[in-house]
C-alpha cells in the first residue's frame, strides 16, 4: 500500500533531497532554504539560487524549508510554572521547562504544568523524581500515601481509601472506643 501524500509532499518527492518543485513550473527544482532562513522568492530557473532571507527576531525555522514565513517563537507559560531553559534563536524555538525539584505534568501533548517533586517525608524514595514523573514514595508504618505524600494514619477515618493501609491503627481506635463502653 502506498501511503497517502498531500499535495506539498507529492510535489517535493519529485525533486531530489534538499530541493522542492517550483510552484509555478514543475520542471524546475529549487534548493530549499537552510534552517534559520525562509523562502523570499523561488529560484528563477534550474541551477539558479533560491532567494532565502534570515528569520527576523522573534521567529525561527528549525530545519531546511520552503516556508513563506518563519515560525513565531514559543513563549513559556508562566501561569503553568514554566521557565525558559534556552531562548529562541533564528534556527531553534524557545525551550521551556520546570525549575529544579519539579516535574512536568502534561495536560495535552504540548502543554505541561510544573509541580513540585514529592519529598517523601515520613517515607522513603522508591523512585527519584524525573522530568515527566513525580517521585514514587513508600510510606513508613503508621502513614499512608495520599496524592504521593505520606500522611499520618491518625487522619484516616473508616470507609476512606486509606483504611486497608492503616488497618492496625483503625482497629486500635475501634478497640479504644469499644473499651470505653460498658
Amino acid at each position: 500500500l502506498v501511503p497517502h501524500l498531500g499535495d506539498r509532499e507529492k510535489r517535493d518527492s519529485v525533486c531530489p533531497q534538499g530541493k522542492y518543485i517550483h510552484p509555478q513550473n514543475n520542471s524546475i527544482c529549487c534548493t530549499k532554504c537552510h534552517k534559520g532562513t525562509y523562502l523570499y522568492n523561488d529560484c528563477p530557473g534550474p541551477g539558479q539560487d533560491t532567494d532565502c532571507r534570515e528569520c527576523e527576531s522573534g521567529s525561527f525555522t528549525a530545519s531546511e524549508n520552503h516556508l513563506r514565513h518563519c515560525l513565531s517563537c514559543s513563549k513559556c507559560r508562566k501561569e503553568m510554572g514554566q521557565v525558559e531553559i534556552s531562548s529562541c534563536t533564528v534556527d531553534r524555538d524557545t525551550v521551556c521547562g520546570c525549575r529544579k525539584n519539579q516535574y512536568r505534568h502534561y495536560w495535552s501533548e504540548n502543554l505541561f504544568q510544573c509541580f513540585n517533586c514529592s519529598l517523601c517525608l515520613n517515607g522513603t524514595v522508591h523512585l527519584s523524581c524525573q522530568e515527566k514523573q513525580n517521585t514514587v514514595c513508600t510510606c513508613h508504618a503508621g502513614f499512608f500515601l495520599r496524592e504521593n505524600e505520606c500522611v499520618s494514619c491518625s487522619n484516616c477515618k473508616k470507609s476512606l481509601e486509606c483504611t486497608k493501609l492503616c488497618l492496625p491503627q483503625i482497629e486500635n481506635v475501634k478497640g479504644t472506643e469499644d473499651s470505653g463502653t460498658t
Epitope: 514529592s118 514523573q133 496524592e147 504521593n148 481509601e161 486509606c162
Partner: nanobody, 120 residues
Framework: EVQLLESGGGLVQPGGSLRLSCAAS????????MGWVRQAPGKGLGWVSA????????YYADSVRGRFTISRDNSKNTLYLQMNSLRAEDTAVYYC?????????????RGQGTLVTVSS
C-alpha cells in the same frame, strides 16, 4: 467504589450558558485534583479544566480560558463547571474525572459523561 455522576448538560444556543455538576463518592473528594475532560464528535479526549483539592490552583485549556470557570464544594463532594459564551465547537460529551498527577495517564477515574450541544 469510586463513582462520578455528571449532570447539567443539554442543548443551548451559541452565546448561551450551562453549569455542569459532578457528584463524587467512594473516595475522599477534598484530597484530590479533579477536572473536566471532553470528547467532541469524532475527536479524542482532551482536558478542559482542572482544580486542586483545596481549590487554590486551577488549569484551563486555552480554548476555554475566560469563558469557563471550574469550582468545587468539598463539603458537598461536588465539582462544577460554569460554561459561558458557548460556541458550536464546545459541543461534546463532558466527563468529570479524578486527576492523576505524577506521570502516566492523566486520570484514574471518570464518569459516564453528560452531552453538551451548542446549536441554533
Amino acid at each position: 467504589e469510586v463513582q462520578l455522576l455528571e449532570s447539567g448538560g443539554g442543548l443551548v444556543q451559541p452565546g448561551g450558558s450551562l453549569r455542569l455538576s459532578c457528584a463524587a463518592s467512594g473516595f475522599t473528594f477534598g484530597w484530590y485534583w479533579m477536572g473536566w475532560v471532553r470528547q467532541a464528535p469524532g475527536k479524542g479526549l482532551g482536558w478542559v479544566s482542572a482544580i486542586s483539592g483545596s481549590g487554590g490552583s486551577t488549569y484551563y485549556a486555552d480554548s476555554v480560558r475566560g469563558r469557563f470557570t471550574i469550582s468545587r464544594d468539598n463539603s458537598k463532594n461536588t465539582l462544577y463547571l460554569q460554561m459561558n459564551s458557548l460556541r458550536a465547537e464546545d459541543t461534546a460529551v463532558y466527563y468529570c474525572a479524578k486527576v492523576k498527577l505524577g506521570g502516566g495517564p492523566n486520570f484514574d477515574y471518570r464518569g459516564q459523561g453528560t452531552l453538551v450541544t451548542v446549536s441554533s
